[in-house]
């Protein structure tokens, strides 16, 4: 029976992934019962990605390593809609590392997953970035202009946002 074997395969995958993420929240995508998309619990989902707000305070490098161990990266923001979704889950009195850095201090910003940096899709606070020694980007809230990006020193511990593709089983 096709449906039975599909269910057995799915349960097997879920069991296999439990060693990395003890719980997955899955939804059926579309009308086809074959397509289940999952995010680890309690990650949130938007379009084809899962997001995790890490409240532990770590340097940028340690934050990225923490994400990568889970099969994710520090968040790469591709659209205004994506940023609008992300900020719903952030606290206004906190700052969160993005997957954006300028390792050489030459204002060659690069996303951790090699997505090309597009100046037209950036959400820097006004006047930012403003310091060649501040080589990592955070998102934070400023009462004058709401949520935006700021450059800061990479070693200063911050909260962070991890992003991964949805898990399809």
């Amino acid at each position: 029976n096709f449906m039975y074997s599909k269910t057995v395969k799915r349960l097997s995958k879920l069991r296999e992934y439990q060693q990395y993420h003890p719980s997955l929240t899955c939804v059926m995508e579309g009308k086809d019962i074959e397509d289940w998309s999952c995010c680890p619990t309690p990650w949130t989902s938007f379009q084809s990605s899962c997001y995790f707000i890490s409240t532990g305070m770590q340097s940028w490098t340690k934050s990225q390593k923490n994400c990568s161990v889970m099969g994710a990266d520090l968040v790469v923001i591709n659209t205004r809609e994506e940023q609008d979704f992300i900020i719903q889950n952030l606290k206004r009195n906190s700052s969160y590392f993005l997957g954006l850095s300028d390792p050489g201090g030459r204002r060659h910003w690069q996303w951790v997953d090699q997505t090309p940096y597009n100046e037209n899709v950036t959400f820097w606070h006004s006047g930012e970035p403003n310091n060649l020694d501040e080589r990592c980007a955070i998102i934070n809230f400023r009462s004058s202009e709401e949520w935006g990006w700021n450059d800061i020193h990479c070693h200063v511990p911050q909260k962070s946002i991890c992003k991964m593709k949805k898990i399809y089983i």
Epitope: Y17, G71, D113, K165
Partner: nanobody, 127 residues
Framework: QVQLQESGGGLVQPGDSLTLSCADS????????MGWFHQAPGKEREFVAA????????AYADSVKGRFTISRDNAKNTVYLQMNNLKPEDTAVYYC????????????????????WGQGTQVTVSS
């Protein structure tokens, strides 16, 4: 826990071939996307090649396209880098790296995307 061990490096002449291997002693190798990077003295670690968990998707640095081939054998918990027509500029320490991935078709080219690294194997191309 992921533990990676490279082998197969050595001293070869320009135009020669070499195959590097990277073995993982972990139990769930097939859930890890793999990459090869190299580091020449005084330089940053650079991307060479990457492969998805299934082996179906690969990527290469422009400098090695058409000369190097990455492959994997999930039954043997091993990833390979076949290097043909080696050039003096390929001289470097070669590292393999692993990263958990839930997508059979995703590969990763950024060194910071890989939390697990081997110790490296030296490749020297000289006449």
């Amino acid at each position: 826990q992921v533990q990676l061990q490279e082998s197969g490096g050595g001293l070869v002449q320009p135009g020669d071939s070499l195959t590097l291997s990277c073995a993982d002693s972990g139990r769930t190798f097939s859930n890890y996307a793999m990459g090869w990077f190299h580091q020449a003295p005084g330089k940053e670690r650079e991307f060479v090649a990457a492969i998805s968990t299934s082996g179906g998707s690969t990527a290469y640095a422009d400098s090695v396209k058409g000369r190097f081939t990455i492959s994997r054998d999930n039954a043997k918990n091993t990833v390979y880098l076949q290097m043909n027509n080696l050039k003096p500029e390929d001289t470097a320490v070669y590292y393999c790296a692993a990263r958990l991935s839930f997508s059979g078709s995703s590969y990763y080219q950024g060194p910071l995307q890989y939390p697990y690294w081997g110790q490296g194997t030296q490749v020297t191309v000289s006449s």
